[in-house]
């Protein structure tokens, strides 16, 4: 025998209290598939979240973050403070990248500049807080008098945590 609930479309639920009639989802709830015995409660976007997409009877609300914050996790499960390019978020707030490191985004941690000399190449463009070093040809490939000195990128200080 076919389950009468399987006929209930998305946006409704199979109401056991009413002889398994398909009832519309109550306000602030939704069902995204047919045959549901309950509707799910809509996600609320509070605090530093803002509503990207309103909840409907067939789909959940979607949140993103208010300006100055960016999403983390699947479905924007949390917001994190933006920093400027050339900075990283530490437990004391946004801090400039240390010498020898860069961050070209508003999120994430500062990364060490590419060490061109490790690949036997010269530095074409020096690294900055906001951008990586750009490597050029190896010094041997350069014409006489056009050699470039590549200081090694300093390592992070021991114990430095990128949090």
């Amino acid at each position: 025998l076919q389950d009468p609930c399987s006929n209930c479309p998305a946006g409704t639920f199979c109401d056991n209290n009413r002889n398994q009639i398909c009832s519309p989802c109550p306000p602030n709830s939704f069902s995204s598939a047919g045959g549901q015995r309950t509707c799910d409660i809509c996600r609320q976007c509070k605090g530093v979240f803002r509503t990207r997409k309103e909840c409907s009877s067939t789909s959940n609300a979607e949140c993103d973050c208010t300006p100055g914050f960016h999403c983390l996790g699947a479905g924007c499960s949390m917001c994190e403070q933006d920093c400027k390019q050339g900075q990283e978020l530490t437990k004391q707030g946004c801090k400039d990248c240390r010498f020898g490191t860069f961050n070209d985004q508003k999120r994430g941690i500062c990364q060490p500049w590419t060490n061109c000399s490790l690949d036997g190449k010269s530095v074409l463009v020096n690294g900055t807080k906001e951008s990586d070093a750009v490597c050029g040809p190896s010094p041997a490939d350069l014409s006489p008098g056009a050699s470039s000195v590549t200081p090694p990128a300093p390592a992070r200080e021991p114990g430095h945590s990128p949090q």
Partner: antibody
């Protein structure tokens, strides 16, 4: 079935440090925020700080800033809480707790680790 | 930081309705969760995002949050509900605050 298993009880001297571990099993480790919450004897719950392992992002309650460090090792699905410059008032049960993905509730808790600070 | 204030204790007769309040500036603008803790045990989430009940939590537990106050309501209170209850708030970032806790006594 998600489980958070914490390291065993510790007895520490004032001024020293303690590092408590919290190993997660039965779920995705790197996308869920792990928080550390402590409870002194007969007192309430106190949020210390948390980390989202997959993002390397940590944050701390103002009261503990500079004294607590929370880290995570994705390869072993383990979070750590290190508290330094211990004093007798730090005697407490320390819990790790996992936040639900999209909402604000801590749906899974470790069994707790008693840290006793005594000279 | 938002500060959350709870009454230290609430008493209720079996079968009656217990209400535990949690107040803080503009608390209704943030998410509120509630935890039950029995002696010697880890806390258990009973309400999240103001009014949602995790699976396995009895229907007699409900929550609301507006203005400056979040409320945990236990209707038809049972002896097994005697415990400490903590509210907690979340603003969407990696930052959480707990209230001081309320001891619920079932008379």
């Amino acid at each position: 079935q998600v489980q958070l298993v914490q390291s065993g009880a510790e007895v520490k001297k004032p001024g020293s440090s303690v590092k408590v571990s919290c190993k997660a099993s039965g779920g995705t480790f790197n996308s869920y925020a792990i928080s550390w919450v402590r409870q002194a004897p007969g007192q309430g719950l106190e949020w210390m700080g948390g980390i989202i392992p997959g993002f390397g992002t940590a944050n701390y309650a103002q009261k503990f800033q500079g004294r607590v460090t929370i880290t995570a090792d994705e390869s072993t699905s383990t979070a750590y809480m290190e508290l330094s410059s211990l004093r007798s008032e730090d005697t407490a049960v320390y819990y790790c707790a996992r936040k639900n993905e999209e909402d604000g509730g801590f749906d899974h808790w470790g069994q707790g680790t008693l840290v006793t600070v005594s000279s | 930081d938002i500060e959350l204030t709870q009454p230290p204790s609430v008493s209720v007769a079996p079968g009656q309705t217990a209400r535990i309040s949690c107040s803080g500036d503009n608390l209704g603008d943030y998410y509120a969760s509630w935890y039950q803790q029995k002696p010697g045990q880890a806390p258990v989430l009973v309400i999240y995002d103001d009014s949602n009940r995790p699976s396995g939590i009895p229907e007699r537990f409900s929550g609301s949050n507006s203005g400056n106050t979040a409320t945990l309501t236990i209707s038809g209170t049972q002896a097994e509900d005697e415990a400490d209850y903590y509210c907690q708030t979340w603003d969407g970032t990696l930052h959480f605050v707990f209230g001081g806790g309320t001891k619920l006594t079932v008379l």
